[in-house]
């Protein structure tokens, strides 16, 4: 807390400018017009303030708007977002993408932070859904954002918003969440011919049931093992030895190096010895 | 560290002119800000010019638009303002300021630091 001093004669800022960089905290908080701050909110981040002097500029709108600031403030708050709390951040109405975007552009090249998180979900919640523009945003900088939300937020995703999914975006997602977007993929991608959907829906194969898998293995699609490998234990058990050979191509070989791994193991176990001898890998049932 | 050494100073008629020299040496490769701070007797430190690296633009006083320029020669890590049309009221200690970062980044952290110089008076009489 910053004690109420007078602003001494003649440093009464007239504008938010460079003048005030070697102001001492109290002078800041005596001289520098809360209205006038939140006016000029897009100086602020040209000006190289200290941490120190961020908090004091912060003070001055927590004061101004104690029930949560304005979007053209947030628009232009700059590196003053990083003196946010998540506390802060749920009292905002965010419902630009540009007012995002600026944000995230602060937090750029670092972990996804509580507030950065908080805002994400303020967004979200506040558009209804994560629409196409939303998701393409937010996996630009946060390449693991989609693996971060529950099947349930998943739901929430229209199959539109799926063509704005990269392969590396899906990586740290698990069975479960890969259970809510795989059909959505599966929607999406429908209208595509046989190998141009496949190179698309191919990182989404870890929700696919088995149907899919025996379907596409009568497409010449040649899965690698490192998709094979992802695929769920259940959906590959009922495959046969002749739709695992068609659905791998000449990657089949491969199982060989994944025989003691899941789900290669685990399927293995559930084939007759002489099938498995048809692939002529050595692999013992 | 860095150390900054003003030079230049010295007693003046009004109309006349003065060159103050800031030489820094030090780590001053991350400088976000360069300016000159004056301190008039009896009154608080003015910002009077500065250069802002982070935004790339110039800063002036009022007071002093269109008689000072503020320059820097890198390649002697020297400050310059070159002061014009002096007057009386220009009187003051004049100080080499510079705003540094821990590092500096593209995205323009905001862990900084003040140094400064040991001051130069300029005495503006007739």
């Known amino acids: 807390e910053v004690e109420k001093t007078a602003c001494p004669s003649g440093k009464k800022a007239r504008e938010i400018d460079e003048s005030l960089i070697f102001y001492k905290k109290w002078e800041l908080e005596a001289c520098v017009d809360a209205a006038l701050l939140a006016t000029q909110m897009d100086r602020v981040n040209a000006i190289p303030f200290t941490y120190e002097q961020l908090d004091v500029l912060k003070h001055k709108l927590d004061e101004l708007y104690p029930q949560g600031y304005p979007e053209s403030v947030i628009q232009h708050l700059g590196y003053l977002f990083l003196k946010m709390s998540p506390e802060d951040i749920r009292k905002w109405n965010v419902t630009s993408l540009e007012t995002l975007k600026a944000l995230l552009e602060v937090n750029k090249g670092h972990e996804m932070s509580p507030q950065v998180a908080t805002l994400i979900d303020r967004f979200v919640k506040g558009r209804g859904q994560l629409d196409k523009d939303t998701l393409d945003t937010l996996t630009a900088f946060y390449p693991g954002y989609l693996c971060s939300l529950s099947p349930e937020e998943l739901s929430s995703v229209p199959p539109s918003s799926i063509w704005a999914v990269r392969p590396q975006d899906l990586d740290t997602c698990d069975p479960r969440q890969l259970d809510v977007l795989y059909p959505k993929a599966r929607l999406a991608f429908q209208n595509m011919n046989g190998s141009e959907y496949f190179v698309k829906i191919q990182s989404f194969l870890g929700g696919a049931p088995t149907e899919d898998l025996k379907a596409l293995s009568q497409q010449n699609v040649s899965m690698d093992l490192a998709t094979f490998m992802k695929l769920r234990t259940d959906a590959v058990l009922p495959l046969t030895v002749a739709e695992v050979q068609k659905l791998l191509g000449p990657h089949v070989e491969g199982l060989k190096a994944e025989e003691r791994h899941r789900p290669v193991r685990d399927w293995i176990l559930r084939q007759r010895q002489d099938d498995l001898d048809t692939l002529g890998l050595g692999l013992q049932g | 560290q860095v150390q900054l050494v003003e030079s230049g100073g010295g007693v003046v008629q009004p109309g006349r002119s003065l060159r103050l020299s800031c030489a820094a040496s030090?780590?001053?490769?991350?400088?976000?800000?360069m300016g000159w701070v004056r301190q008039a007797p009896g009154k608080g430190r003015e910002l009077v010019a500065g250069?802002?690296?982070?935004?790339?633009?110039?800063y002036y006083a009022d007071s002093v638009k269109g008689r000072f320029t503020i320059s820097r020669d890198n390649s002697k890590n020297t400050l310059y303002l070159q002061m014009n049309s002096l007057r009386a009221e220009d009187t003051a200690v004049y100080y080499c300021?510079?705003?540094?970062?821990?590092?500096?980044?593209?995205?323009?952290?905001?862990?900084?630091?003040?140094?400064w110089g040991q001051g130069t008076l300029v005495t503006v009489s007739s």
């Open positions: 300021a510079v705003r540094t970062g821990d590092s500096y980044t593209s995205d323009y952290r905001r862990d900084l630091h003040d140094y």
């Open positions: 030090g780590n001053i490769f991350n400088w976000f800000y």
């Open positions: 250069i802002n690296r982070g935004a790339n633009t110039y």
